[in-house]
């Protein structure tokens, strides 16, 4: 007999063909011989089966010798052997209906686990293979678990259920609630305005919650809360902000913070947390601020950076249009008795300039 796999809530067409392409008597019954539907005259009649109100047939195909039964809004319990009686012959079709659902909400925080559960008819032994949007493959039986969701797991998961060499495909949309970036670094010259942006990696119809930015300045012994805010239907309102520095916050998404001036005492690392309404756990994004200062004091030209820099970054002092350069993998460089002219202080990573500051050295007579 033919095996057909269906999905819970879906529609399936069970085909039944007569050898002669003409309109003839036919009936569909279940394994208990209860009539579901059939022809009486030219009318489609329905039997006492619990399926009858969800079963249909296409009259337009009858004169092509096709007497399909279409079942709408499939249920797991519709799994059965169905018998089509046409032209004094019986065609059997085994229908197996499967359901695949996420155990929890499909909007999950980064790091949380996802469990998919397969509903299947008694006596079946299906296998399930799921592929994440990022191409990760996971196999299982009745349940499939993804222990720690990552940002790239957001999107449509495609799961294939296999039984009796037949397959049925499920698509499940998973939204991983996270910031677009885990970490970002802003490089600024002393005195410049600093813009911090925290774009979300998802969109929700209604977005409500509260957040806070904690800051650990490089020069400070402990971290402190710079700002707390509320988010209501994508509108941002500041609850509390420190006096120094006095941060400003945008009223709309993406979350946007402005520090009026980059100063060495602000250089360091911050952690922005966002707790969403009706969700356990918080979203996190780390943000770093690196500040550069170039100064001339008496016969000494100095360039310094503050904040979290990697040891492989190079700090250089270079006289414009001249070969004179001093470079170090350090947080400060200096030149004694510098030549007059425009000096450049450069912070670079493998040749790529991250930050530069110019300082003019005037001749001393």
């Amino acid at each position: 007999k033919k095996v057909v796999l269906g999905k819970k809530g879906d529609t399936v067409e069970l085909t039944c063909n007569a050898s002669q392409k003409k309109n003839t008597q036919f009936h569909w019954k279940n394994s208990n011989q209860i009539k579901i539907l059939g022809i009486q005259g030219l009318f489609l009649t329905k039997g006492p089966s619990k399926l009858s109100d969800r079963a249909d047939s296409r009259k337009s195909l009858w004169d092509q010798g096709c007497f399909s039964m279409i079942i709408k809004n499939l249920k797991i319990e519709d799994s059965d052997t169905y018998i089509c009686e046409v032209e004094n012959k019986k065609e059997e079709v085994e229908l197996l209906v499967f359901g695949l659902t996420a155990n929890s909400d499909t909007h999950l925080l980064e790091g949380q686990s996802l469990t998919l559960t397969l509903e299947s008819p008694p006596g079946s032994s299906p296998s399930v293979k799921c592929r994440s949007p990022g191409g990760k493959n996971i196999q299982g039986g009745r349940t499939i678990s993804v222990p720690q969701l990552e940002r790239q797991d957001s999107g449509t998961w495609t799961c294939t259920v296999s039984q009796d060499q037949k397959t049925v495909e499920f698509k499940i949309d998973i939204v991983v609630l996270a910031f677009q970036k885990a970490s970002s670094t802003v490089y600024k010259k002393e005195g410049e305005q600093v813009e911090f942006s925290f774009p979300l990696a998802f969109t929700l119809e209604k977005l409500t919650g509260s957040g806070e930015l904690w800051w650990q300045a490089e020069r400070a012994s402990s971290s402190k809360s710079w700002i707390t805010f509320d988010l209501k239907n994508k509108e941002v309102s500041v609850k509390r902000v420190t006096q120094d520095p006095k941060l400003q916050m945008g009223k709309k998404l993406p979350l946007h913070l402005t520090l009026p001036q980059a100063l060495p005492q602000y250089a360091g690392s911050g952690n922005l947390t966002l707790a969403l309404e009706a969700k356990t756990g918080k979203l996190h994004q780390e943000v770093n601020l690196v500040v550069m200062r170039a100064t001339q004091f008496q016969e000494n030209l100095t360039c310094e950076v503050w904040g979290p820099t990697s040891p492989k970054l190079t700090l250089s002092l270079k006289l414009e249009n001249k070969g004179a350069t001093v470079s170090k993998q350090a947080k400060a460089v200096w030149v004694l008795n510098p030549e007059a002219g425009m000096w450049q202080c450069l912070l670079s990573d493998s040749g790529q300039v991250l930050l530069e500051s110019n300082i003019k050295v005037v001749p001393t007579w």
Epitope: T11, E13, D56, S60
Partner: antibody, heavy 115, light 107 residues
Framework: QVQLQQWGAGLLKPSETLSLTCAVY????????WSWIRQSPGKGLEWIGE???????NYNPSLKSRVTISVDTSKDQFSLKLSSVTAADTAVYYC?????????WGQGSLVTVSS | DIQMTQSPSSVSASVGDRVTITCRAS??????LAWYQQKPGNAPKLLIY???SFQSGVPSRFSGSGSGTDFTLTISSLQTEDFATYYC?????????FGQGTKLEIK
């Protein structure tokens, strides 16, 4: 609730090929047949043809020689191609879901054939 | 092809009136008939199928009857939102065919 969204070129020159696509959202793609219907002031509502998930098609004999309906089950989409168009093919084209009745329709695409 | 003929092609009526539209098939189609309502700029909307069954969400003032070749759509008490064009469609055999439409206008 199933939604059908359709798109395609709106202005064609005679002898060109009309091409429209319809995407099915939020409902079962399998088990149903997916139709194209057009509506013009002169001919009223005219059924063009249909396809199912397996690619089985039925066409209106009056248009059969010029019509191709195809399906992309990976995207839950189906498409219409009508070749050698003339001014008589100017109409609003609809995609629709059918078993026996057209119970869900696309928003319609106005196709104008003019030199 | 099965020809579907609707009458009248247009009808003027007032809110609260009872209106009947008829549809005749060129050959017997048992009860394989549907009725649709279409408002300007919109796609048709299924009202009645199997000649007399209601599509979900359709108000009970709409009713369908008939079998074989003659069918009727009745609106028992016209409401403002019912002014539209109505079409019948046969699903008995390919190609599916529609009536030419009946435009229901405010008197």
């Amino acid at each position: 609730q199933v939604q059908l969204q359709q798109w395609g070129a709106g202005l064609l020159k005679p002898s060109e090929t009309l091409s429209l696509t319809c995407a099915v959202y939020g409902g079962s793609f399998s088990g149903y047949y997916w139709s194209w219907i057009r509506q013009s002031p002169g001919k009223g509502l005219e059924w063009i043809g249909e396809i199912n998930q397996s690619g089985s098609t039925n066409y209106n004999p009056s248009l059969k020689s010029r019509v191709t309906i195809s399906v992309d089950t990976s995207k839950d989409q189906f498409s219409l191609k009508l070749s050698s168009v003339t001014a008589a093919d100017t109409a609003v084209y609809y995609c629709a879901r059918v078993i026996n009745w057209f119970d869900s329709w696309g928003q319609g695409s106005l196709v104008t054939v003019s030199s | 092809d099965i020809q579907m003929t609707q009458s009248p092609s247009s009808v003027s009526a007032s809110v609260g009136d009872r209106v009947t539209i008829t549809c005749r098939a060129s050959q017997g189609i048992s009860s394989w008939l549907a009725w649709y309502q279409q408002k300007p700029g919109n796609a048709p909307k299924l009202l009645i199928y199997d000649a007399s069954s209601f599509q979900s969400g359709v108000p009970s003032r709409f009713s369908g009857s008939g079998s074989g070749t003659d069918f009727t759509l009745t609106i028992s008490s016209l409401q403002t939102e019912d002014f539209a064009t109505y079409y019948c469609q046969q699903a008995n055999s390919f190609p599916y065919t529609f009536g030419q439409g009946t435009k229901l206008e405010i008197k």
